[in-house]
Interface confidence: low
């Protein structure tokens, strides 16, 4: 019997070989029941990919973003 469309997170897997220099822009998705989803638009091929939140430069980016938010 057909079921209603099931819940799926936007990121199927996370890519850990994404250079900061190849990122056009980032978006952080706050999707319920999902791990932190960070999506990058790449400069070289315009595709959107999910970035591993454990990447060093991502951690630095998030830290800066949070500091900015709390300073305001």
């Amino acid at each position: 019997k057909p079921v209603s469309l099931s819940y799926r997170c936007p990121c199927r897997f996370f890519e850990s070989h994404v250079a900061r220099a190849n990122v056009k822009h980032l978006k952080i998705l706050n999707t319920p029941n999902c791990a932190l989803q960070i999506v990058a638009r790449l400069k070289n091929n315009n595709r959107q990919v999910c970035i591993d939140p454990k990447l060093k430069w991502i951690q630095e980016y998030l830290e800066k973003a949070l500091n900015k938010r709390f300073k305001m």
Epitope: L5, R8, C11, R12, P32, C34, R47, Q48, C50
Partner: antibody
Framework: QVQLVQSGAEVKKPGASVKVSCKVS????????MHWVRQAPGKGLEWMGG????????IYAQKFQGRVTMTEDTSTDTAYMELSSLGSEDTAVYYC????????????????WGQGTLVTVSS | DIQMTQSPSSLSASVGDRVTITCRAS??????VNWYQQKPGKAPNLLMF???TSQSGVPSRFTGSGSGTDFTLTISSLQPEDFATYFC?????????FGQGTKVEIK
């Protein structure tokens, strides 16, 4: 490779419902973001709805809200689109289409389409 | 809803001609525009996504450009197999609207 195979043509009376199926091969249905698009004879393409991973739910075009239901059977990797209260203006070819994805599911475009199912509404 | 206005609605051209199809969005949509080619009795076929990126296998004579509200699909040298209808589509936000189509016919 991914293939979407749709059910055959249907002829329906006004007021009836139609259920079109779309069988996925080459991938499992839960790995896809499936959408439905229709095209009236000689007209353009009209997006009806589909699964939006960012919201975690199926979203429908307002025009079809309350009249369309999109479901799936994960055991057979088949997606369904049911449209009720049919009128002559619903005569169209109905397509299922997969949204492009890599690591990120809703990656912009519809890259793979079913062959289309012609639904004719006539008394 | 975001409206996609495509022009021209039809055009006649000869093999070897340069053809340009334009699409205007009713609001700024960055580069979230895709282009499809459709032949009679067939499903649409993705040519271009993210405004300017070719889908794999698409001939290099097809190029896309634009950002914000104005987008262009160009066929640098029209080939016999290019006579078809072309649609733009926005994937910026649902509902994912299409342009009304441009039919490219043989002159």
């Amino acid at each position: 490779q991914v293939q979407l195979v749709q059910s055959g043509a249907e002829v329906k009376k006004p007021g009836a419902s139609v259920k079109v199926s779309c069988k996925v091969s080459g991938y499992t249905l839960t790995e896809l973001s499936m959408h439905w698009v229709r095209q009236a004879p000689g007209k353009g393409l009209e997006w009806m709805g589909g699964f939006d991973p960012e919201d975690g739910e199926t979203i429908y075009a307002q025009k079809f809200q309350g009249r369309v239901t999109m479901t799936e059977d994960t055991s057979t990797d088949t997606a369904y689109m049911e449209l009720s209260s049919l009128g002559s203006e619903d005569t169209a070819v109905y397509y299922c289409a997969r949204r492009v994805w890599g690591s990120y599911r809703p990656n912009d475009a519809f890259d793979i389409w079913g062959q289309g199912t012609l639904v004719t509404v006539s008394s | 809803d975001i409206q996609m206005t495509q022009s021209p609605s039809s055009l006649s051209a000869s093999v070897g001609d340069r053809v340009t199809i334009t699409c205007r969005a009713s609001q700024s949509i960055s580069d979230y525009v895709n282009w499809y080619q459709q032949k009679p009795g067939k499903a649409p076929n993705l040519l271009m996504f993210a405004a300017s990126t070719s889908q794999s296998g698409v001939p290099s004579r097809f190029t896309g450009s634009g950002s914000g509200t104005d987008f262009t699909l160009t066929i640098s040298s029209l080939q016999p197999e290019d006579f078809a209808t072309y649609f733009c589509q926005q994937s910026y936000s649902p509902p994912y609207t299409f342009g009304q189509g441009t039919k490219v016919e043989i002159k």
